[in-house]
Interface confidence: medium
């Protein structure tokens, strides 16, 4: 199809299911997270064809936007991905699920902002604790995919400098309470948990206190199960190549897939002068496929040695898993060897490369 092809992403119901039609679900994600929205069929019946719409405009599948009939994934989210999302019946545009998505900086993954919120001399003689960056603390609900890093921050000040401690679901929270431990960064007023799992879900409270008083803030963490999707191929790979006759060429294809991917390299060929069959499917020959002793790494590279003019043409990296297939293509142009060019030049011929 020329446009809007649905990528059918199937699998478990998401951890954050869609709200009832007419209700709007509020979701907050961190910058760099994967936004995952799920809209199961009402009453468990057949869904029918759907479209996903953001701020009234239809979403077109891309490397970053994975569109399925019941699920939408936006990878590596940024502020621009904030907005009103809806899953609609394709024909009538009837809204099946409605979400309000906000992508914010903090709490964020990683430690790129360390050092910004260290204790500072505020010039106050004495005083109870107070929040120094309240605008960074308005994100009360954090929904992140499993395996991500989560950081909760409670930047504060006071005189004397207050202490900070953390509670999970109202109880003291220490590193031994979770596999992988936690990182307490008192200078940055932060709690960091790497590679979160569903058991990390819960309410996290920072308690900031000194002898003049105590303040606290509670965040809710929801950990989304990773949703299966078809393989993702790195943009720009394989790349078009130009090679001289007799030289060696390598095409590269980088595949990302949760489910075990199956990689093949194909070359497009002509049959009876046609590149496609009666059903529109291109004619191809399989150059490389998984064998007993081939690794995924080996399959991500296609090597052509001592290329001939017959090697010129279109090559495709095809990656599939239990969910679906993805493919990227590139072209190989084979030029005559230099000495041939020189001879031709002397004979007065011109080659357009």
């Amino acid at each position: 199809e020329s446009l809007g092809t649905e990528q059918r992403v199937v699998g478990r119901a998401a951890e954050v299911p869609g709200p009832e039609p007419g209700q709007q679900e509020q979701l907050v994600f961190g910058s760099g997270d994967a936004v995952e929205l799920s809209c199961p069929p009402p009453g468990g019946g057949p869904m029918g064809p759907t479209v996903w719409v953001k701020d009234g405009t239809g979403l077109v599948p891309s490397e970053r936007v994975l569109v399925g009939p019941q699920r939408l994934q936006v990878l590596n989210a940024s502020h621009e991905d904030s907005g009103a999302y809806s899953c609609r019946q394709r024909l009538t545009q009837r809204v099946l699920c409605h979400f309000s998505v906000r992508v914010t900086d903090a709490p964020s993954s990683g430690d790129d902002e360390d050092g910004e919120d260290e204790a500072e001399d505020t010039g106050v003689d004495t005083g109870a604790p107070y929040w120094t960056r309240p605008e960074r603390m308005d994100k009360k609900l954090l929904a992140v995919p499993a395996a991500n890093t989560v950081r909760f921050r409670c930047p504060a000040a006071g005189n004397p400098t207050p202490s900070i401690s953390w509670l999970k679901n109202g109880r003291e929270f220490r590193g031994e309470h979770r596999i992988g431990g936690i990182k307490l960064r008192h200078q940055q007023w932060s709690l960091v948990m790497e590679s979160v799992v569903p058991s990390d879900r819960g309410n996290y409270t920072c308690v900031v206190e000194n002898k003049f008083g105590s303040i606290r803030q509670t965040y809710t963490l929801d950990v989304l199960e990773r949703s299966p999707h078809r393989p993702i191929l790195q943009a720009g790979l394989p790349a078009n190549q130009t090679a001289v006759l007799g030289s060696d060429v390598e095409f590269h294809c980088k595949v990302y897939s949760d489910a075990q991917p199956h990689i093949q390299w194909l070359k497009h060929v002509e049959v009876n002068g046609s590149k496609v069959g009666p059903d529109g499917t291109p004619y191809v020959t399989v150059l490389k496929t998984a064998g007993a002793n081939t690794t995924d790494k080996e399959l991500e590279v296609l090597s052509l040695h001592n290329v001939t003019f017959e090697d010129a043409g279109e090559y495709t990296c095809l990656a599939g898993n239990s969910i679906g297939f993805s493919h990227h293509s590139a072209w190989l142009v084979v030029l005559p060897a230099e000495e041939e060019l020189v001879e031709a030049d002397e004979a007065g011929s011109v080659y357009a490369g």
Epitope: S2, P49, T57, R90, L91, Q93
Partner: antibody, heavy 116, light 110 residues
Framework: EVQLLESGGGLVQPGGSLRLSCAAS????????MSWVRQAPGKGLEWVSA????????YYADSVKGRFTISRDNSKNTLYLQMNSLRAEDTAVYYC?????????WGQGTLVTVSS | QSVLTQLPSASGTPGQRVTISCTGS????????VSWYQQLPGTAPKLLIY???HRPSGVPDRFSGSKSGTSASLAISGLRSEDEADYYC???????????FGGGTKLTVL
């Protein structure tokens, strides 16, 4: 290549009936919602009817409700429009169109003339 | 009388930029995605813009669509003589439970 080919148009008297067909090829017909759109001579486009791919739900413009019936035969890759109680104002070129949810492909149309 | 309102005509000279507008309501443009269709004389309509602002492959980037509130616009830059055609906007209308088109705008290239 996506192709939609309408047939069944012609001259019919007021009150008469016609059945239009649209033969589809080049795509998985059963996966897509389909519509009929008409255009009276020298006038603009008017949506007539649509049929869902998932459950066969049908939708009609008020101007044809109760007189026209849209249907599909997925095994034959064909869309139909049964037109009864035809009126002079139904005179138009009738196009079948594929939905996504816009009309991304159109047939060339078949002319229906309602005249005594 | 069309549910979506378009000016009946528009014109421009080659190389110019012209904008064709389409006004609706919250039950159609305000809540649903807009498409634009080009109909050259004597031919079937052709999809020009879908999902408010996306171009199908093969449509030149001289054509662009936008939407704000209950109005949509089609802009054609670098106008060419072959752009002379009728242009229609369309979207689903929740109240009518049907697809609606604008009355069409006839573009003349002077």
């Amino acid at each position: 290549e996506v192709q939609l080919l309408e047939s069944g148009g012609g001259l019919v008297q007021p009150g008469g009936s016609l059945r239009l067909s649209c033969a589809a090829s080049g795509f998985t017909f059963s996966d897509y919602d389909m519509s009929w759109v008409r255009q009276a001579p020298g006038k603009g486009l008017e949506w007539v009817s649509a049929i869902s791919s998932s459950d066969g739900s049908t939708y009609y413009a008020d101007s044809v409700k109760g007189r026209f019936t849209i249907s599909r035969d997925n095994s034959k890759n064909t869309l139909y429009l049964q037109m009864n109680s035809l009126r002079a104002e139904d005179t138009a070129v009738y196009y079948c169109a594929k939905h996504l949810p816009n009309f991304d492909y159109w047939g060339q149309g078949t002319l229906v003339t309602v005249s005594s | 009388q069309s549910v979506l309102t378009q000016l009946p005509s528009a014109s421009g000279t080659p190389g110019q930029r012209v904008t064709i507008s389409c006004t609706g309501s919250s039950s159609n443009i305000g809540n649903n995605t807009v498409s634009w269709y080009q109909q050259l004389p004597g031919t079937a309509p052709k999809l020009l813009i879908y999902y408010d602002s996306h171009r199908p492959s093969g449509v030149p980037d001289r054509f662009s669509g936008s939407k704000s509130g209950t109005s949509a616009s089609l802009a054609i830059s670098g106008l060419r003589s072959e752009d002379e055609a009728d242009y229609y906007c369309g979207t689903w209308d929740d109240s009518l439970n049907g697809y609606v088109f604008g009355g069409g705008t006839k573009l003349t290239v002077l």
